[in-house]
């Protein structure tokens, strides 16, 4: 799986989209989980409505919401009031029984608000991150990075990455 990088500004909302084949995943609930590092397990954050036909209803867990367009094949996750601790690796998943298929791997990066002059030691500034060794680009903001590329993105985005 490529990893798609979504960048958002601290304090603002970030929308993550995960496209999928609506026929292949027909009848399946979806979930959004946070991965504990690249090698760690994925811990469930929020999942779509227990009744698949009601998947379009937005469900919240804290500041994270999920909604599923089952006909169009797009899962949308909203991270409200983005904070530095929200940065990291996530997965969009399609659930069947006790199994989960990965629809998309996502890296969320939290950018400093250029208008906020408080200490931003915890926040990511374009150019500071380690280079993505095998990424590829899309555009909340999103793009995929090429091998060895160090991202110097615009101020709020979505990238792609292996």
């Amino acid at each position: 799986h490529n990893t798609t990088v979504f960048q958002g500004v601290a304090g603002q909302s970030l929308q993550v989209s995960c496209p999928y084949d609506s026929m292949k995943h027909w009848g399946r609930r979806k979930a959004w989980c946070r991965q504990l590092g690249e090698k760690g397990p994925c811990q469930r954050v929020v999942s779509t409505h227990n009744l698949w036909l009601l998947s379009f209803l937005r469900r919240w867990n804290g500041s994270t919401a999920i909604t599923d367009d089952t006909l169009g094949g797009t899962l949308t996750i909203t991270l409200r009031n983005l904070q530095p601790h929200d940065a990291g690796l996530y997965q969009c998943q399609s659930l069947h029984g006790s199994e989960a298929d990965t629809l998309r791997k996502v890296l969320v990066e939290v950018l400093a608000d250029p208008l906020d002059h408080r200490d931003a030691g915890d926040l990511w500034f374009p150019g500071e991150s380690e280079s993505f060794e095998d990424a590829h680009v899309e555009h909340s903001i999103s793009r995929s990075l090429l091998e060895g590329e160090i991202p110097f993105p615009p101020t709020s985005h979505h990238h792609h990455h292996h």
Epitope: E38, K39, P41, D122, S129, E130
Partner: antibody
Framework: QVQLQQPGAEPLTPGASVKMSCEAS?????NFWITWVKLRPGQGLEW???????????NYNEKFKSRATLTVDTSSTTAYMQLSSLTSEDSAVYYC?????????????WGHGTLVTVSA | DVLMTQSPLSLPVNLGDQASISCKSS???????????LEWYLQRPGQSPKLLIY???NRFSGVPDRFSGSGSGTDFTLKISRVEAEDLGLYYC?????????FGGGTKLEIK
């Protein structure tokens, strides 16, 4: 900038316990794994275990599992390793280290190490 | 546990020479996620180790391009194209794919 601060030295006696600290600064503490590594002169590096501060998840080297306990205090952004029932074999430098980035788990940031000396 | 075997134990070189260090793992070190977590570290006397290479062949930020990593499966190599004085020290390979993660025994790069 990312910094991991460790106390310089811990002189101890056999059978004692030690709780080593690793104070992290310059980044969001809960977002990255912290690893502990042992260095004995002439013996090379040995991986003890790691901990994810955001959840408390741990992995241990079975060799240390019965005597080493990894914990974190997120309020003080400090990782700890407690080592019990010390013997002279535990005399070593103990490093804490942090992974480089979400997509690069290599140990890019290291503390200066705590020298543990166990002698009667 | 995965045993990481480095060779040679000691590597005497002239400055400007090429140096090559081998690291063999006792089993395949591909992680369940498809990545191979093979890293190379340099430890200079009295200093903490320094990350040089991650995921077999990716140079870490700020590492000179004279350092290169290669390999797959169980055989890995670190090459230094032109050795400089600051490159001297102990080199360790490390596998972070299978718990417990393990280091190689180290290779001492020294002046001939």
């Amino acid at each position: 900038q990312v910094q991991l601060q460790q106390p310089g030295a811990e002189p101890l006696t056999p059978g004692a316990s030690v709780k080593m600290s690793c104070e992290a600064s310059g980044y969001t503490f809960t977002n990255f794994w912290i690893t502990w590594v042992k260095l004995r002169p002439g013996q090379g590096l040995e991986w003890i275990g790691d901990i994810y501060p955001g959840s408390g998840n741990t992995n241990y080297n079975e060799k240390f599992k019965s005597r080493a306990t990894l914990t974190v205090d997120t309020s003080s952004t400090t990782a700890y390793m407690q080592l019990s029932s010390l013997t002279s074999e535990d005399s070593a430098v103990y490093y804490c280290a942090r992974e480089a980035y979400y997509t690069n788990p290599g140990f890019a940031y290291w503390g200066h190490g705590t020298l543990v000396t166990v002698s009667a | 546990d995965v045993l990481m075997t480095q060779s040679p134990l000691s590597l005497p070189v002239n400055l400007g020479d090429q140096a090559s260090i081998s690291c063999k793992s006792s089993q395949n070190i591909v992680h369940s996620n498809g990545n191979t977590y093979l890293e190379w570290y340099l430890q200079r006397p009295g200093q903490s180790p320094k990350l040089l290479i991650y995921k077999v062949s990716n140079r870490f930020s700020g590492v000179p391009d004279r350092f290169s990593g290669s390999g797959s499966g169980t055989d890995f190599t670190l090459k230094i194209s032109r050795v400089e004085a600051e490159d001297l020290g102990l080199y360790y390979c490390f596998q972070g794919s299978h718990v417990p993660y393990t280091f190689g025994g180290g290779t001492k790069l020294e002046i001939k």
